[in-house]
């Protein structure tokens, strides 16, 4: 009876999400393997988040709006482990917008989800950021490693979206 009611709840939750995400990829987790955590297909998952790499070249503002329409934000990177996971799926000759910007050009960087900007957990390439006119951040491959660079927000780039996993 308990299992039946849990399944009914799950199905109704799945139907609810189906209007936003036609297909979900779910895995069982939790100590009793009773919880399902899902990401939209074909997003990838890491820890409690889902990631989508957009190859459409757009400005930073349009990229953020594009993520927003999908219920996500441009990616906020919180740890080196998270960055290492993300970069496995990136092309080394491309650049991708992050959810990090400095709209006033005062070097007051801010994450799109209001996560406090912690200078101790940043992965800027050497010598970056280097221009107050370059107010948006990308991740790219340079000098044999992935790192961040400040660029012009209006210049079209690829981008990475991030959203919380859906639990059902």
């Amino acid at each position: 009876n308990f299992m039946y009611s849990k399944t009914v709840k799950r199905l109704s939750k799945l139907q609810e999400y189906q209007q936003y995400y036609p297909s979900l990829t779910c895995v069982m987790e939790g100590k009793d393997m009773e919880d399902w955590s899902c990401c939209p297909t074909p997003w990838t998952s890491f820890q409690s988040s889902c990631y989508f790499i957009s190859t459409v070249m757009q400005s930073w503002t349009k990229s953020q709006n594009n993520c927003s329409v999908m219920g996500a934000d441009l990616v906020v990177i919180n740890t080196k482990e998270e960055q290492d996971f993300i970069t496995q799926n990136l092309k080394i000759n491309s650049a991708y917008f992050l959810g990090l910007s400095d709209p006033k050009g005062w070097r007051h960087w801010q994450w799109v989800d209001q996560t406090p900007y912690n200078k101790n957990v940043t992965f800027w390439h050497s010598g970056e950021p280097n221009s107050p006119d370059e107010r948006c951040a990308i991740i790219n491959f340079r000098s044999e490693e992935w790192g961040w660079n400040d660029v012009h927000c209006h210049v079209p780039q690829k981008s990475i979206c991030k959203m919380k996993k859906i639990y059902i």
């Epitope: 503002t61 910007s101 709209p103 006033k104 221009s131 006119d133 107010r135 660029v151 012009h152």
Partner: antibody
Framework: EVQLVESGGGLVKPGGSLRLSCAAS????????MSWVRQAPGKGLEWVST????????YYPDSVKGRFTISRDNAKNSLYLQMNSLRAEDTAVYYC??????????????WGQGTTVTVSS | DIVLTQSPASLAVSPGQRATITCRAS??????????MHWYQQKPGQPPKLLIY???NLESGVPARFSGSGSGTDFTLTINPVEAEDTANYYC?????????FGGGTKVEIK
């Protein structure tokens, strides 16, 4: 006082080349992105190319891509536009303009007086 | 590319009256309260001159009779009251994404 002075315009045959220059003074040239904007006779404004302050970024519309090259010499406070394979439709007054960044975009806060390019056989 | 459509193409206004020019973008040029639309004035034989930046900010030295408003896709430049020296072409320009684009212009004549 900010000043932008263009030169190098003239009459050229189709397929020919010209190099426009823009001499900047009255501001720290190396700190600003710069653009070329043109205006065909009796027509509106059309952006032609942009170069970032540090020379790391250049951008062109499809109409001139591969034919025009923007460059700058910060030591000489000068902006250039090399125009090759010129066509009749490139006939216009060419303005150099300074970019001032605002939030996620920019605007053109100072313009030169322009130099006239005529492409005709 | 973002297309900017200005209207009207031309208008004649009596001195002391109000002139209103609109600029419609093919997609939003606003983001979180910042509106990346700018206005320029161009008098015959002269280069363009910046009037208004970011939809509503008056450039230094520009008379207060010029004002701008709008957000998203719809923007307005207002001259009130119009003076004889305002005879010119007026252009809007967006910069939220490359390439930067200009409207087709509006010719303002003083009756």
């Amino acid at each position: 006082e900010v000043q932008l002075v263009e030169s190098g315009g003239g009459l050229v045959k189709p397929g020919g080349s010209l190099r426009l220059s823009c001499a900047a003074s009255g501001f720290t040239f190396s700190s600003y992105g710069m653009s070329w904007v043109r205006q065909a006779p009796g027509k509106g404004l059309e952006w032609v190319s942009t170069i970032s302050s540090g020379d790391s970024y250049t951008y062109y519309p499809d109409s001139v891509k591969g034919r025009f090259t923007i460059s700058r010499d910060n030591a000489k406070n000068s902006l250039y536009l090399q125009m090759n394979s010129l066509r009749a439709e490139d006939t216009a007054v060419y303005y150099c303009a300074r970019q001032l960044y605002y939030s996620y975009g920019y605007y053109f806060d100072y313009w030169g007086q322009g130099t006239t390019v005529t492409v005709s056989s | 590319d973002i297309v900017l459509t200005q209207s009207p193409a031309s208008l004649a206004v009596s001195p002391g009256q109000r002139a209103t020019i609109t600029c419609r973008a093919s997609e939003s040029v606003s983001f979180h309260g910042t509106h990346l639309m700018h206005w320029y004035q161009q008098k015959p034989g002269q280069p363009p001159k910046l009037l208004i930046y970011a939809a509503s900010n008056l450039e230094s030295g520009v008379p207060a009779r010029f004002s701008g408003s709008g957000s998203g896709t719809d923007f307005t430049l207002t001259i009130n009251p119009v003076e004889a020296e305002d005879t010119a072409n007026y252009y809007c320009q967006q910069s939220i994404e490359d390439p930067p684009t200009f409207g087709g212009g509006t010719k303002v004549e003083i009756k």
